[in-house]
């Protein structure tokens, strides 16, 4: 008669490497009497005998995983017990090896020049695959702008036109290599004016051709505005070559005007706009104003009545035939544009435009418009209307998205005088100081001027009608 013998595992479990979808077997050879009951666990959880993913044979001594999945990774143990002595256990690891697999491949991307592009490439595999990228037929080199992230994604900062092309990602480990399909990176470029129209001083009844050239991807369209309205007369000729559009507006001149060339292209649902303006004035138009560019007078209009100080003298530009009507028409057009902007921006922008088109005026031998203090111009740009002016940030273009402000003339902040240099040399905007407490700490200004604590909207160094182009920087 055989003597009872406690179980002894004669073949301890070892680490098993297995490829996904292949078979993996653990062997747990046991000597004992009577025959032991052998059970198996994975990560300390009992494997059920009826689980069809496993096969348990040889009285429980062989555990086979019939088709390995990546989730089968873990510690497998066999436990043998026959009632004699204690149960015995042996454990081994299953390491699931996997050829590289691209789980989130890159997709075609359209991106605006100057922004950041990320092409995804999420991978699986064991050992962890290394990810590289191919552009066209060549391996892509990383640099200060281009980096392959830990996730495998490709990040391109400050996207340039030359980044456009076909890309694919490559995932590689010791077991193999996986390639994504080719994807296209298309770089769109904001509309930008290459050649602005030039101002002209002509005799009554002459013909003038204003030329405006713009570039962008997609190719922009060009429209012309005369004193704030669509051009009513004149002929337009256009040609397109190598993403450059050339527009020529021929005019028969019977009155002075401010002509604005507006180049627009579309990026998804948004538009980018660039603009440049030129004046057409008539020689000897008004002999009485020959030596001055304008005069000081009380504002008698309606649009800016609530914004400008009561009875204030403002500057009227005599390059217009009828300055008061022309400037009122311009502000009226601008006012309509402002309907689309945010409630935070709108009153600030209204103050900006009114003080810009109707600058505070110092009467004297030569009437002089007073520009707005630079810091208040910056406040409108950076604080009150930050979102609306976002498209102005790119150094290459001068227009705005269609945020409701895309046609508005705005001054170039950096060219305005600073309130820190000469507080009496620039104007401030009442609305901004009134509102500033609700938004952020905002500068209060010491000055000998009565409106010292009141910021006034930015004004440009030259009057509106004379300046050939506007931007905010």
């Amino acid at each position: 008669e055989k003597l009872p013998k406690a179980p002894v595992i004669t073949t301890p479990l070892e680490t098993v490497d297995a490829l996904v979808e292949e078979v993996a077997t653990f062997m747990c050879a046991v000597e004992s009497y009577p025959q032991p009951e052998i059970s198996w666990t994975r990560n300390k959880i009992l494997i059920k005998l009826f689980d069809t993913r496993y096969s348990i044979r040889e009285n429980g001594q062989l555990l086979t995983i019939l088709s390995v999945e990546d989730s089968d990774d873990g510690i497998y143990c066999c436990i043998a017990n026959n009632g004699v002595g204690g149960a015995v256990e042996s454990c081994g690891a299953l390491q699931v090896k996997m050829k590289p697999k691209i789980t989130r491949p890159p997709i075609n991307v359209k991106i605006i020049e100057g922004l950041k592009a990320v092409l995804p490439c999420t991978t699986m595999g064991n050992p962890k695959p290394s990810v590289s990228w191919i552009k066209g037929d060549n391996a892509l080199r990383e640099n200060s702008r281009i980096a392959v992230l830990e996730s495998g994604s490709l990040r391109i900062h400050n996207v340039q036109k030359e980044d456009a092309g076909q890309y694919r990602c490559v995932a590689k480990n010791s077991l193999g290599t996986a390639y994504s399909k080719l994807v296209k990176l298309e770089v769109e470029v904001f509309a930008r004016i290459l050649r602005a129209p030039e101002s002209h001083n002509v005799t009554f009844g002459s013909f003038v051709t204003l030329r405006c050239t713009a570039i962008g991807i997609p190719v922009p369209t060009i429209s012309w505005i005369e004193n704030g309205n669509a051009v009513s007369s004149g002929s337009i000729q256009e040609s397109v070559k190598d993403r450059v559009i050339d527009s020529r507006l021929q005019l028969f001149i019977t009155k002075p005007g401010l002509y604005t060339c507006i180049a627009t292209n579309k990026h998804g649902e948004k538009f980018s706009t660039a603009k440049a303006a030129a004046t057409v004035s008539i020689a000897e138009w008004s002999k009485s104003q020959k030596d001055s560019q304008g005069y000081c007078a009380q504002y008698r209009g309606e649009v800016c009545d609530a914004v400008l100080a009561k009875d204030a003298l403002v500057f009227f530009n005599t390059s217009y035939r009828d300055p008061e009507d022309a400037q009122e028409l311009l502000i009226h057009t601008a006012w309509n544009e402002l309907k689309a902007v945010s409630p935070l921006c709108r009153p600030a922008a209204e103050a900006l435009l009114c003080n810009h088109l109707f600058q505070e005026c110092s009467p004297g031998v030569v009437p002089t418009p007073m520009p707005i203090c630079r810091e208040y111009c910056l406040a409108v740009k950076e604080l009150f209307c930050a979102k609306e002016w976002q498209a102005m940030e790119g150094k290459a273009h001068r227009g705005l998205y269609r945020s409701g402000m895309h046609l508005l003339p705005v001054p170039e902040c950096s060219k305005l005088p600073s309130m820190h240099r000469d507080p009496t040399a620039c104007t401030r905007l009442p609305y901004l100081d009134y509102k500033k407490e609700n938004i952020t700490t905002f500068p209060s200004i010491t000055s000998s001027r009565p409106s010292a604590d009141i910021p006034n909207l930015p004004a440009s160094t030259s009057s509106f009608a004379v300046s050939p182009a506007y931007s905010m920087t």
Epitope: E375, Y376, L378, A379, K381, E382, L383, S414, K415, P417, S418, H420, R421, D422, P423, A425, T440, F442, P443, S444, I445, T446, S447, T461, T473
Partner: antibody
């Protein structure tokens, strides 16, 4: 890296002239207002002159008005100080310094970067 | 021109001390005041602007306070690198002016 390098200092007789230059690099020079500040040997700092980014606005200290001229060439990333009718009291280290605005965009940070200075000695 | 007066002219202190320097303006300058640190033979360095805004990269032991005509620069715990001359400067209007300087030396 922002760098300002002054040059043109030296020994000059009273009544003489000198032209200082400041070469700027590491930033968009044409977007910033620039200044000259001086420091007499063993003394404190004195602001001399300022020029706006587009040269539209120029300011001088009363002590140099009519004698000194500030200018800039944005194409060459350079700032200049033409000093005429020099006096002994103009002897100092002359620094060029930049003004900028903080990240909010509208708070001035005066003289946020300085050059190493150039010594001007006015003596007979 | 606006006159700026600093006190004291010289200050002797030890490492770890809390140090305060006062700057007075001859008329109100709101909070348009900057503080600079200068070491011998070197250019000044901007520490504080707008009276209390810390310039990027400047240690947080430096702080500024005040508005109107009275301003204070505080170094909460003096470090060996802080022995230098400190200047205040107003930039409220046209002619920007500096204080005469405060020299912080080792006691």
């Amino acid at each position: 890296e922002v760098q300002l390098v002054e040059s043109g200092g030296g020994l000059v007789k009273p009544g003489g002239s000198l032209r200082l230059s400041c070469a700027a690099s590491g930033f968009t020079f044409s977007s910033y207002d620039m200044n000259w500040v001086r420091q007499a040997p063993g003394k404190g700092l004195e602001w001399v002159s300022s020029i706006s980014s587009s040269s539209s606005y120029i300011y001088y200290a009363d002590s140099v008005k009519g004698r000194f001229t500030i200018s800039r060439d944005n194409a060459k990333n350079s700032l200049y100080l033409q000093m005429n009718s020099l006096r002994a009291e103009d002897t100092a280290v002359y620094y060029c310094a930049r003004d900028s605005y903080d990240s909010s965009g509208y708070y001035l940070r005066p003289f946020d970067y300085w050059g190493q200075g150039t010594l001007v000695t006015v003596s007979s | 021109d606006i006159q700026m007066t600093q006190s004291p002219s010289t200050l002797s202190a030890s490492v770890g001390d809390r140090v305060t320097i006062t700057c007075r303006a001859s008329q109100s300058i709101d909070n348009w005041l900057a503080w600079y640190q200068q070491k011998p033979g070197k250019a000044p360095k901007l520490l504080i602007y707008k009276a209390s805004s810390l310039e990027s990269g400047v240690p947080s032991r430096f702080s500024g306070s005040g508005s109107g005509t009275e301003f204070i620069l505080t170094i909460s715990s003096l470090q060996p690198d802080d022995f230098a001359t400190y200047y205040c400067q107003q930039y409220n209007s046209h002619s920007w002016t500096f204080g005469q300087g405060t020299k912080v030396e080792i006691k």
